[in-house]
């Protein structure tokens, strides 16, 4: 039951997070424009990965979109790519991870294709996540750097006492969001990927148990359950089955840095 | 169309109050701003203000946010504009306008005059 | 707050002529967002309340005469007159819609020959 569980959460996990990367990646609101020790404007300037928007007091909004490829900064581009490629994996992955659902019967599917494909998708979305958060620390870094450049010559003379003010830019929601999102995916993968141990069908040498009955070494090998996977021969003769009723899949759960979840 | 009504003149003694109100018509009152704006006879425009009908929200030039308040009442689809301590120096017509693209104000109502007098 | 100067404060000129009045602003008004300037003209004529020529510099408001042009970027703008008509006698404004609080220039008096 645990495994079936831990896949499912894993799942739900992860596509909520996939959700919000591709909410992320389509959010306007990547950088915004910086209100503190600013002039008050009546004008408010905010960039996404895709077009730039202007909302006026007045109520209106104008967004106009990059219609130019070559003429865009190539740390843009890299976000954009890491946040498609996420998107992509993630789709995949999600796509991989129905067919790989415990509690979905698909024909004669195998406990060993079902782990495969568990372990595929919790790959997939590991990635998937760190695409995501990539590209997002990769644009915050740059809004970073320019809105410390800006802030270096913020009020560029134009000689007289005419002067210019630089609209600086400080992180919008979609960074947020992005980050959040990534950091689901991320754990939804792993859950997948602890949930694939569960699933993978056991090592069929099952290990000899020995009971000592009237002097003689009689060989008892326990079936109807699934062995645990045991590292090393077992010398001491103890008893590795404890005999009591346990579902299939029921497995040792150990502490995980992701037990928070 | 697009109008703005704005109530009478008013000639009031210093020291007093006076609320002056604009009633729009012809557009949906809580999507646009109202501007309030004071010209004094023969002088230039100033920008007093704006309220946000539909959430209340204002935005005061610094230097009349003691003399006047904005409010909005959305049931009777309305603009109001409270002028408080009133002195000779407030004499003015008062004009409401609505904000439009470009912040700018493209209807305005006919204005009040008010006349602080002893 | 941000000063707009308009020059000269009054002209006189005859029916038919062309003409130029000037509106400098203290800082500039283009928003870098949409490369938009944010600057206003009006024209008022007495007893009347101010009405909208342009917007956002050099746009025309609808149903205003296309002898009326807006131009300039930055802090330095200009309002074109192209054949002057006797019904344009009015006040003419610019007003900054960029920064709060938003003013108005004193305003260039248009009087007819």
């Known amino acids: 039951m645990a495994v079936t569980a831990c896949q499912g959460l894993g799942f739900v996990v992860s596509l909520i997070g996939i959700a919000g990367i591709i909410a992320a990646t389509c959010m306007d609101q990547w950088s915004t424009q910086d209100l503190y020790n600013n002039p008050v404007t009546a004008v408010f300037n905010y960039q996404g990965l895709w077009r730039s928007c202007v909302r006026e007091s007045s109520g209106f909004t104008e967004c106009r979109g990059y219609f130019t490829l070559l003429g865009l900064p190539a740390m843009l581009q890299a976000v954009r790519a890491l946040m498609i490629v996420g998107i992509v994996l993630g789709a995949i992955g999600l796509l991989v991870s129905i067919f790989a659902l415990k509690c979905i019967r698909i024909g004669s599917m195998e406990d060993s294709a079902k782990a495969n494909m568990t372990l595929t998708s919790g790959i997939m979305f590991i990635v998937s996540g760190l695409c995501a958060i990539a590209g997002v620390s990769v644009f915050a870094n740059m809004l970073v750097t320019n809105f410390w450049m800006s802030t270096a010559n913020m009020y560029t003379g134009m000689g007289g006492m005419v002067q210019t003010v630089q609209t600086r830019y400080t992180f919008g929601a979609a960074l947020f969001v992005g980050w959040v999102a990534g950091g689901l995916t991320l754990i939804g993968g792993v859950m997948m990927c602890i949930a694939c141990r569960g699933l993978a069908p056991e090592e069929t040498n099952y290990k000899a148990v020995s009971y000592h009955a009237s002097g003689h070494s009689v060989a008892y090998k326990p079936g109807g359950f699934k062995a645990s996977t045991g590292f090393g021969s077992n010398t001491k003769n103890k008893k590795i089955y404890d005999g009591g009723a346990r579902t299939e899949d029921e497995v040792q759960s150990y502490p995980s840095k992701h037990d928070y979840v | 169309q697009v109008q703005l009504q704005q109530s009478g003149r008013e000639v009031v003694r210093p020291g007093t109050s006076v609320k002056v109100s604009c009633k729009p018509s012809g557009y949906a009152f809580t999507n646009y701003l109202i501007d309030w704006v004071k010209q004094r006879p023969g002088q230039g425009l100033e920008w007093i203000g704006g309220?946000?009908?539909?959430?209340?929200?204002?935005v005061y030039n610094e230097k009349f946010k003691a003399k006047a308040t904005l409010t909005a009442d959305k049931s009777s689809m309305t603009a109001n504009m409270q002028l408080s301590s009133l002195t000779s120096d407030d004499s003015a017509v008062y004009f409401c306008a609505r904000r439009v693209r470009g912040n700018s104000f493209d209807s305005w109502g006919q204005g009040t005059l008010v006349t602080v007098s002893a | 707050d941000i000063q707009m100067t308009q020059s000269p404060s009054s002209l006189t000129v005859t029916a038919g002529e062309k003409v130029t009045m000037s509106c400098k602003s203290s800082q500039s008004l283009l928003n870098s967002g949409n490369q938009r300037n944010y600057l206003t003209w009006y024209q008022q004529k007495t007893g009347q309340p101010p009405k909208l020529l342009i917007y956002w510099a050099s746009t025309r408001e609808s149903g205003v005469p296309d002898r009326f042009t807006g131009s300039g970027s930055g802090t330095d703008f200009t309002l074109t007159i192209n054949s002057v008509q006797a019904e344009d006698l009015a006040v003419y404004y610019c007003q900054n819609n960029y920064y709060y609080p938003l003013t108005f220039g004193a305003g260039t008096k248009l009087e007819i020959k």
């Open positions: 309220i946000n009908p539909g959430s209340g929200d204002t």
